[in-house]
């Protein structure tokens, strides 16, 4: 209460000060500054608290993106999109909300995290949970059997996110999927190649891609004695092995999910194994697992996959990990997940994962769920966890104290003397029309120092300075902000000179 009274007093004092300055006909700049102060004080005072208790914030699990964060985000997206396009993908978009029915029964235990919308004119709607189910719906609806597409958009999950670790309720996904009937494992291998290309290009640290197969998991559960009805729920327990110990996972399976302890132990013998193609070959010799048709198919495909991954030169980044059991119901074949590795404290220690940054797999049955005749369209895809990547890139840039440009302005149109606003407006317009990214300060007579300072702060590389003499001579002074070197450039050559200096193509084709 005392604080509000103090602020009210300051608002009153500042109001008097502004009025006094106006009466004294003080400089416009001083009045402008003091008015700005008054407005800031009033903003802090806000509405009377007795009238309003509203706290101004973004909803839980969401955030705004500052220009700096957007600059980081655009760089990350650029790397991802260029890779997707390099691999021949088309782009699509789908509505942010879907019919509730479309999303139901596709996510298993995660369905509780779907956001339902209030009644919208009779239709029961939900916000999309991922981009894969809407893609399958799109394929079925448009009777498509063959497409390679990418889709970058926001998805929504009613999670309890740890936002500091790059987890949110509203977040971007960057998906790449290949739909169609092709020879085994070729599209799957390309998806893994794309994942590795993107993570390498982003330079966010060393990573490992864990690979498994849903059929191997299901076969393993079957031979261990897990009933069909418990497959999915046991899967979600096994999937926690990257975060918690086997003991905790076993306790959950036995204590919460009603699995017999000896069944859990049998599962434990398998899911704690990981390795390369040699582990695939070892399991192909496993007397029990090799007798299971599903598991055998899965292992055969993985053997083939490793051959292709070797040809793509990424086999060193891939680990066959039997504990990988991605929680989504729709996977039917190969599944994979990329994790960043923390450098081990001691040589010879196991690399330590710091969370998934990309994931995906094969889902051959999802499109069929939407087709009245149950016609299947085999699909395989991947999703890049860009929110976590944004967080990592932001932290890295902060640690390096790197200055990030938040605009792409190439040149500031400045004046060295007063009364040159018209000339600045004419010149900036000429530059815009020629495709040059240009700005000017919104003041009639800005000080040259302020204009140069603005360039330094905004990272603008060039200043085009107009002066009385330059106007007479038909030249513009072009100044490099970093080197401070100035040259007179003929007005008709200015566009070309700016393009040359900023490495922009000379025509805007």
């Amino acid at each position: 209460m005392a604080e509000r009274a103090a602020l009210e007093e300051l608002v009153k004092l500042q109001g008097e000060r502004v009025r006094g300055l106006k009466q004294q006909k003080a400089s416009a700049e001083l009045i402008e500054e003091e008015v700005a102060k008054l407005l800031k004080l009033k903003a802090q005072l806000g509405p009377d608290e007795s009238k309003q208790k509203f706290v101004l914030k973004t909803p839980k699990g969401t955030r705004d993106y500052s220009p700096r964060q957007m600059a980081v985000r655009e760089k990350v997206f650029d790397v991802i999109i260029r890779c997707f396009k390099r691999h021949g993908a088309e782009v699509i978009d789908t509505p942010v909300f879907e019919l509730k029915e479309t999303l139901m029964g596709k996510y298993g235990e995660d369905s509780k995290l779907i956001y339902d919308l209030k009644d919208q004119g009779g239709e029961l709607l939900s916000l999309r949970y991922d981009l894969t189910v809407p893609f399958a719906r799109y394929l079925a609806m448009n009777k498509l059997t063959n497409i390679k597409r990418y889709h970058i958009a926001k998805v929504y999950r009613r999670d309890n996110p740890a936002m500091t670790r790059g987890r949110y309720r509203e977040f971007y996904q960057c998906d790449f999927d290949i739909a169609g009937n092709f020879d085994p494992m070729i599209p799957d291998a390309e998806c893994l190649k794309i994942m590795c290309e993107i993570l390498s290009s982003l330079q966010i640290g060393d990573f490992l891609v864990k690979v498994n197969d849903r059929r191997i998991l299901d076969g393993m559960f079957a031979i261990c004695g897990v009933s069909d009805s418990k497959f999915r729920t046991i899967c979600s327990s096994v999937d926690k092995l990257d975060k918690v110990s086997w003991e905790e996972v076993k306790n959950e399976m036995v204590g919460e999910k009603g699995l017999a302890p000896e069944v859990a132990d049998r599962i434990g013998d398998y899911v704690q194994q990981h390795g390369g193609v040699s582990l695939v070959e070892q399991l192909l010799q496993d007397p029990k697992l090799s007798q299971n048709k599903q598991a055998l198919e899965g292992l055969g495909d993985l053997k083939l996959l490793f051959e292709y991954l070797t040809l793509f030169g990424i086999d060193d980044k891939i680990s066959f990990d039997l504990s990988l059991a991605r929680g989504l119901d729709y996977y039917t074949g190969v599944i994979y997940e990329a994790v960043l590795l923390q450098t081990p404290a001691q040589a010879g220690e196991e690399p330590l994962g710091v969370g998934s940054v990309a994931a995906g797999g094969r889902y051959d049955g999802l499109v069929g769920m939407f087709d009245p005749k149950g016609r299947k369209v085999p699909c395989v895809g991947l999703s890049i966890g860009v929110e976590r990547i944004f967080s990592i890139v932001e932290q890295r840039l902060e640690a390096l104290e790197e200055k990030i440009r938040t605009t792409e302005t190439q040149v500031l149109v400045a004046s060295a003397q007063k009364k040159l606003l018209e000339e600045r407006l004419k010149l900036v317009s000429e530059l815009w029309d020629a495709g040059i990214k240009a700005e000017l300060l919104y003041k009639k007579n800005p000080k040259l120092l302020n204009q140069l300072q603005y360039c330094e702060e905004a990272g603008i590389p060039l200043v085009a300075i107009i002066g009385e003499q330059e106007l007479k001579d038909g030249v513009i002074k072009l100044r490099s902000v970093t080197s401070r070197e100035e040259v007179d450039v003929r007005r008709e050559d200015l566009v070309e000179e700016i393009k040359r200096r900023t490495g922009q193509p000379l025509c805007i084709c």
Epitope: E9, L10, R17, E29, E33, A36, L41, Q453, E457
Partner: antibody, heavy 120, light 107 residues
């Protein structure tokens, strides 16, 4: 926690230069006017310079005008004072401080100070 | 520039005493006045702003009054931690100026 930490002080010869930094944490730095205030050994306080939150406004005491430059980097939550053509009488502890209620020229949060000694 | 003059320049007092320090401005500054406390080797600490508003976290034994050109800082009952130098500062117009300080010592 909410704090200001200065650095960059030291011994410099008359005519020399020095750049002071002030790292802010625990508050929305870009909302606040910031200031440099100095205190000569055993003497009182002197307001040196200020800068507005958005970098739009700055001013300097007559004693330092043309020699000192105040600046800030809101992305790095940092305030700076570039001191050129230093004189003996610039010897002081330099404090950075935050304006009370963002815009009122009264320091409600101060750093611990950094000593600048100008001597031949 | 607005000159700020504090009196006395030093004062001796005992724990429990009531102490008043005065500050005069060379021209009217309305209520644009602050009081600070500074201990040796430390940064100043804001006590009062807008002539009479108590900064949050400052004990209520400190109070300020005045307007225009004449201001006072009062400590109603001195505590051992109050022995320090006190400065007034005008925030009416730049350059913002401080008084020369009042040293409060133990009697």
């Amino acid at each position: 926690q909410v704090q200001l930490v200065e650095s960059g002080g030291g011994l410099v010869k008359p005519g020399g230069s020095l750049r002071l930094s002030c790292a802010a944490s625990g508050f929305t730095f870009s909302d606040y006017y910031m200031t440099w205030i100095r205190q000569a050994p055993g003497k009182g306080l002197e307001w040196v310079s200020y800068i507005s939150g958005s970098n739009a406004y700055t001013d300097y005491a007559d004693s330092v005008k043309g020699r000192f430059t105040i600046s800030r980097d809101n992305a790095k939550n940092s305030l700076y004072l570039q001191m050129n053509s230093l004189r003996d009488e610039d010897t002081a502890v330099y404090f950075c401080a935050r304006y009370v209620y963002q815009v009122v020229a009264i320091g409600d949060l101060w750093g611990q100070g950094t000593l600048v000694t100008v001597s031949s | 520039d607005i000159q700020m003059t504090q009196s006395p320049s030093s004062v001796s007092a005992s724990v429990g005493d009531r102490v008043t320090i005065t500050c005069r401005a060379s021209q009217g500054i309305s209520s644009w006045l602050a009081w600070y406390q500074q201990k040796p080797g430390r940064a100043p600490k804001l006590l009062i702003f807008a002539a009479s508003s108590l900064q949050s976290g400052v004990p209520s034994r400190f109070s300020g009054s005045g307007s225009g050109t004449h201001f006072t800082l009062t400590i109603s009952s001195l505590q051992p931690e109050d022995f320090a130098t006190y400065y007034c500062q005008q925030a009416k117009s730049f350059p913002y100026t401080f008084g020369q300080g009042t040293k409060l010592e133990i009697k």
